[in-house]
Interface confidence: medium
């Protein structure tokens, strides 16, 4: 027995790997972390690695747990433990020289860089208060917010965040569907264009005043977020050009010729005033209607008894109970109505401060032979972006049998955000009314300029003797086109046998926005299923796809490939494409050097290893040959003198031989021309228990032999004429196979060092 | 076939974080496909809470988004929940379930 | 988030009666709807996949029907053992969602 002992010699130099510098915020104090600034020393240990410092020129450098002390010398082990700080003052970009040291060697004139970032500070102005409507929408402004920043941010990259939504309306954007999802995000540029809306929407019970909020969070990275609370006040208070009316409800009233009606709160309604009383007090309050300027062709009665000036007044209450009536005094159609000033009125009919109001009612008087128009039902109007289409009547049209079609007249109450109406010979600018003749003449076109979603027309149609009737309209803006995007196949890890599809497999794009798209199975794959929750499915959507909801499994591990086709359909329209599927081997493939021209090499785990594929299945990976090499062949070889010479060709092989060292890759040269460099590659098929097959290709570099040069490999042969150089003569076998004793002349052998050198050289 | 096995506290104290793991036996957890956890508060619901899939994807409910994180540990075949800052209405029984198969539920209780 | 209203939310029922209940969901689901059944102080159990696919050993006396919205969980025959409480959950959207329950109870 002898022993060896090994001393340590320092005789490798330290490198410097990472050199990237310090962003940190202006005099702020940040460790300099070990991803910015790390060395690596193949025989020292990261606390011999010493960096010393001179005089930073923006800041100083500390320890934690020391930030008074500067320093002027760290290690590696200190970066790695995140206690080397750096503190800045000065310049905002700056640095410090540095060099670095194992004990033994140094390397100097190395700089790292510090860089400091102003702070950038966020602020909101305006009033954060909209004043709205009730029922109505209400863009935010700049008034209402307005979004800044000390750095002057472009507006577009100042994104408001809605963290709690409204409660009593919703907020959406004009350009975007305006009945889908509620908005999330918005930017202060879509504030200052007034495309952030609010909408109010209108509650079963009546009420003067109603307060919501929105929380929102405003960010634009670097800059801390700033949180925002927007107050809105919904009231009847306010003067609003869509909403004439300040009570709960003033529609009017139809009465036939001659006749009477009664007058309910469905046309006369004021309780919105009386819900400014708390409602404990309600019930002891009332709303008191005086009449101004009576009816010019009818009475007004209050149960039953008329009302004049000397009793011009009503109340709420009456209203409620069905007491108050309109009778028309014949004599004629003529428009009729009555002004009224209606206030609150307190217990005991006192009069007390609150919301008033004076208004007027109108009556419209009807000919007792006019028979009101009939709707017919309506197709939607369906056209693509950017195009006009005209209105037919399979979209508007009424049966009337006593009204020419000029006499129906139809008015938009709510337009969409799609587009607009236009009359041909009318201007360019949308209309707002327009007759049945203009619809039977093809002059009534719909201009599809605004976003790309469905959207409705809310109309009023009336023969001007009947009450207006509601109808409405709808538009749905097609694409002109959809295309499946299909930017990569879909790659399954072999271990795992299946894999997430995303919108690098599937994605639509249009002409518009990009639309919520549905798939279809329509050719399955062959060799597995698609699942959407782990479980078979035939359909899914893109949303689906973008949560990584449809996953692709193999259930057949018999192919390395698979593909199925899908068509999607998107608003109407659809495309169809074809998914690759393949699987990504788990093998681990050699990378390095070329590799000696006319030698064999051996063929092991530093080169192609399946091992962890082996652990993850537990069973031994087999790999074929489909391809290759070009120059050369792959052998399997005698491991010892005794077993019989020659080697075989191999085109199928095991992990395990691979492990044993039984193989080896002869390393052709090129033909028919100059001795260089040159490249070549083997394609193999891996195969393993449970999982689906993968072709993986080892490509590799090869060169003439240099007896001179280290390679990183274990060489089992090197060309004869090298051998002879090298005073070993040695003769190949009568397959032109090598002696399995032959090596490098200067072995480098392998990852495996020594051991691998005595192993590939001691086998006899 | 399948079997998951909750563990972990009883008992937590309040803004303190919960912690529970997910032992899977009879597969392993890079063979299903949505390994979640579940909570059911006395007497009402089922309540998802999130999930980490075969691949090491992550999603969660977004009314605890903030809160929890779900992760795993493929060498001892668990997955495992933490859900920070509790509450009393964080009292509950938490599940951890594939859909195909459900651990038996462990109580957690938030009290100090 | 997709809302799922179950109903009733409690029914009684005799031993050899039919069940039905349904599963309302606030959007379309495409069919991604799973029905669990769930014992006092168990873990629910998977009945019912993909709105009418039985799970492995589950009773036939169990079926799942519906589309768009609208889901029905039915026990043609109700037996001793399926007196509990059933969920339906989507997945057809994140968050997954389930229905606040359904409980059977012997008449």
């Known amino acids: 027995a002898f022993t060896v002992t090994v001393l340590p010699v320092n005789d490798q130099p330290p490198i410097l790997t990472t050199n990237t510098g310090l962003q940190m915020w202006e005099g702020a104090t940040a460790p300099i972390p070990a991803e910015a600034l790390r060395s690596t020393d193949g025989d020292s240990g990261s606390e011999d690695l010493v960096y010393t410092i001179e005089q930073p020129s923006n800041g100083r450098v500390v320890l934690r747990g020391a930030p008074g002390t500067e320093v002027r010398s760290f290690t590696q082990a200190q970066l790695d433990g995140g206690l080397v700080l750096f503190s800045h003052r000065g310049t905002l970009d700056g640095g410090f020289r540095f060099r670095l040291s194992d004990g033994e060697h140094t390397s100097p004139g190395h700089f790292f860089r510090v860089t400091a970032q102003k702070q950038v500070l966020l602020s909101l102005k305006g009033s954060q208060t909209l004043t709205v409507c009730p029922g109505s929408v209400q863009p935010l402004s700049s008034q209402t917010l307005r979004a800044s920043s000390s750095a002057g941010t472009d507006p577009q990259l100042l994104l408001y965040r809605v963290v709690r939504g409204p409660q009593l309306g919703r907020l959406f954007h004009a350009q975007q569907d305006s009945t889908g999802e509620a908005l999330v995000n918005f930017t202060q540029a879509e504030v200052y264009a007034g495309n952030i809306l609010y909408e109010h929407e209108m509650p079963p019970e009546p009420f003067w005043e109603a307060h919501d909020t929105l929380e929102l969070q405003l960010s634009s990275p670097p800059a801390r977020d700033v949180a925002a609370t927007l107050a809105v006040a919904v009231s009847f208070e306010a003067a609003c050009p869509q909403r004439p009316s300040h009570l709960w409800k003033n529609k009017g009233l139809w009465v036939p010729e001659g006749q009477r009606a009664r007058i309910t709160v469905a046309a006369l309604d004021a309780s919105n005033l009386l819900a400014s009383v708390p409602s404990p007090q309600r019930s002891e309050h009332d709303v008191l209607f005086q009449v101004t300027q009576f009816p010019s062709r009818g009475q007004l009665l209050v149960s039953e008894e008329p009302l004049h000036a000397g009793q011009p007044h009503f109340l709420q209450s009456q209203l409620a109970a069905g007491q108050l009536v309109y009778a028309h005094g014949g004599g004629g159609t003529q428009q009729d109505g009555f002004h009224f000033r209606a206030h609150l009125q307190g217990p005991a009919g006192a009069s007390v401060a609150g919301p008033q109001t004076s208004e007027a009612f109108a009556i419209t008087v009807r000919d007792v032979n006019e028979r009101p128009p009939q709707p017919q039902a309506s197709v939607p109007l369906r056209l693509t972006r950017g195009s006009r289409a005209p209105i037919s009547r399979a979209q508007l049209s009424v049966v009337d049998p006593d009204s020419a079609p000029g006499e129906i007249e139809y008015e938009v109450q709510r337009a969409p955000h799609n587009g607009f109406l236009s009359l041909v010979g009318g201007g360019l600018g949308p209309v707002t009314r327009f007759t049945q003749a203009d619809v039977d003449s093809g002059r009534l076109a719909f201009v599809a300029n605004g976003s790309s979603v469905a959207g409705i027309f809310q109309l009023s149609m009336s023969d001007g003797a009947s009450p207006p009737l509601p109808m409405s309209l709808a538009v749905d803006i097609l694409p002109s086109a959809i295309e499946v995007q299909l930017r990569a196949p879909l790659e399954v890890p072999q271990a795992l046998g299946r894999s997430s599809l995303s919108q690098q497999q599937l994605r639509v794009v249009s002409d518009r926005e990009e639309p919520e798209a549905a798939y279809r199975l329509i050719q399955g794959p062959q060799y597995g299923h698609l699942l959407v929750g782990g479980r078979p499915t035939s359909a899914f959507s893109q949303f689906q796809i973008d949560q990584g909801e449809v996953v692709f499994a193999f259930t057949n591990f018999s192919s390395s490939h698979d593909h199925f086709r899908v068509l999607a359909l998107a608003r109407g329209v659809n495309a169809s494409a074809v998914v690759n599927v393949t699987v990504r081997a788990l093998l681990h493939v050699w990378a390095g050097g070329p590799w000696p021209q006319g030698a064999t090499l051996r063929l092991d785990p530093t080169v192609l290893d399946a091992g962890e594929l082996a652990n993850r299945t537990g069973s031994v990976p087999r790999f074929r040959l489909l391809e290759g090499p070009r120059h050369g062949r792959v052998v399997r070889v005698p491991r010892a003198r005794t077993e019989p010479g020659g080697s075989q060709l191999v085109e199928q092989f095991t992990q395990q031989d691979l492990e044993d060292g039984r193989l080896g890759l002869e390393v052709g040269r090129p033909e028919g021309r100059a001795p260089g460099p040159a490249g070549d590659s083997l394609t193999l098929e891996l195969w393993a228990q449970g999982v689906p097959p993968a072709v993986a290709s080892l490509d590799f570099a090869t060169e003439p032999y240099n007896a001179a040069r280290p390679y990183s490999v274990a060489l089992l042969s090197v060309p004869e004429a090298a051998r002879t150089e090298a005073g070993k003569p040695e003769s190949s076998t009568p397959t032109g196979e090598p002696g399995p004793m032959a090596s490098s002349p200067e072995p480098a052998v392998a990852k495996g060092g020594f051991l691998s050198f005595l192993e590939a050289n001691m086998f006899s | 076939q399948v079997q998951l096995q909750e563990s972990g506290p009883g008992l937590v104290k309040p803004s303190q974080t919960l912690s529970l793991t997910c032992t899977v036996s009879?597969?392993?957890?890079?063979?299903?496909?949505?390994w979640n956890w579940i909570r059911q508060h006395p007497g009402k619901g089922l309540e998802w809470i999130g999930y980490?899939?075969?691949?090491?994807?992550?999603n969660y409910n977004p009314s605890l988004k903030s809160r929890v994180t779900i992760s795993r540990d493929t060498s001892k075949n668990q997955f495992s929940l933490k859900l920070s800052s509790v509450t009393a209405a964080d009292t509950a029984v938490y599940y951890c379930?594939?859909?195909?198969?459900w651990g038996q539920g462990t109580l957690v209780t938030v009290s100090s | 988030d997709i809302q799922m209203t179950q109903s009733p939310s409690s029914l009684s029922a005799s031993v050899g009666d039919r069940v039905t209940i349904t599963c309302r969901a606030s959007y379309g689901i495409r069919g991604y709807l799973n029905w669990y059944q769930q014992k006092p102080g168990k873990a629910p159990k998977l009945l019912i996949y993909?709105?009418?696919s039985l799970h492995s050993g589950v009773p036939s006396r169990f079926s799942g029907s519906g589309s768009g919205t609208d889901f029905t969980l039915t026990i043609s025959s109700l037996q001793p053992e399926d007196f509990a409480t059933y969920h339906c959950?989507?997945?057809?959207?994140?968050?997954?969602?389930f229905g606040q329950g359904t409980k059977v109870e012997i008449k």
């Open positions: 959950q989507q997945y057809s959207a994140l968050p997954w969602t």
């Open positions: 379930a594939d859909f195909d198969y």
């Open positions: 980490i899939t075969f691949d090491g994807r992550n």
């Open positions: 009879g597969g392993s957890i890079t063979d299903g496909y949505y």
């Open positions: 993909y709105t009418s």
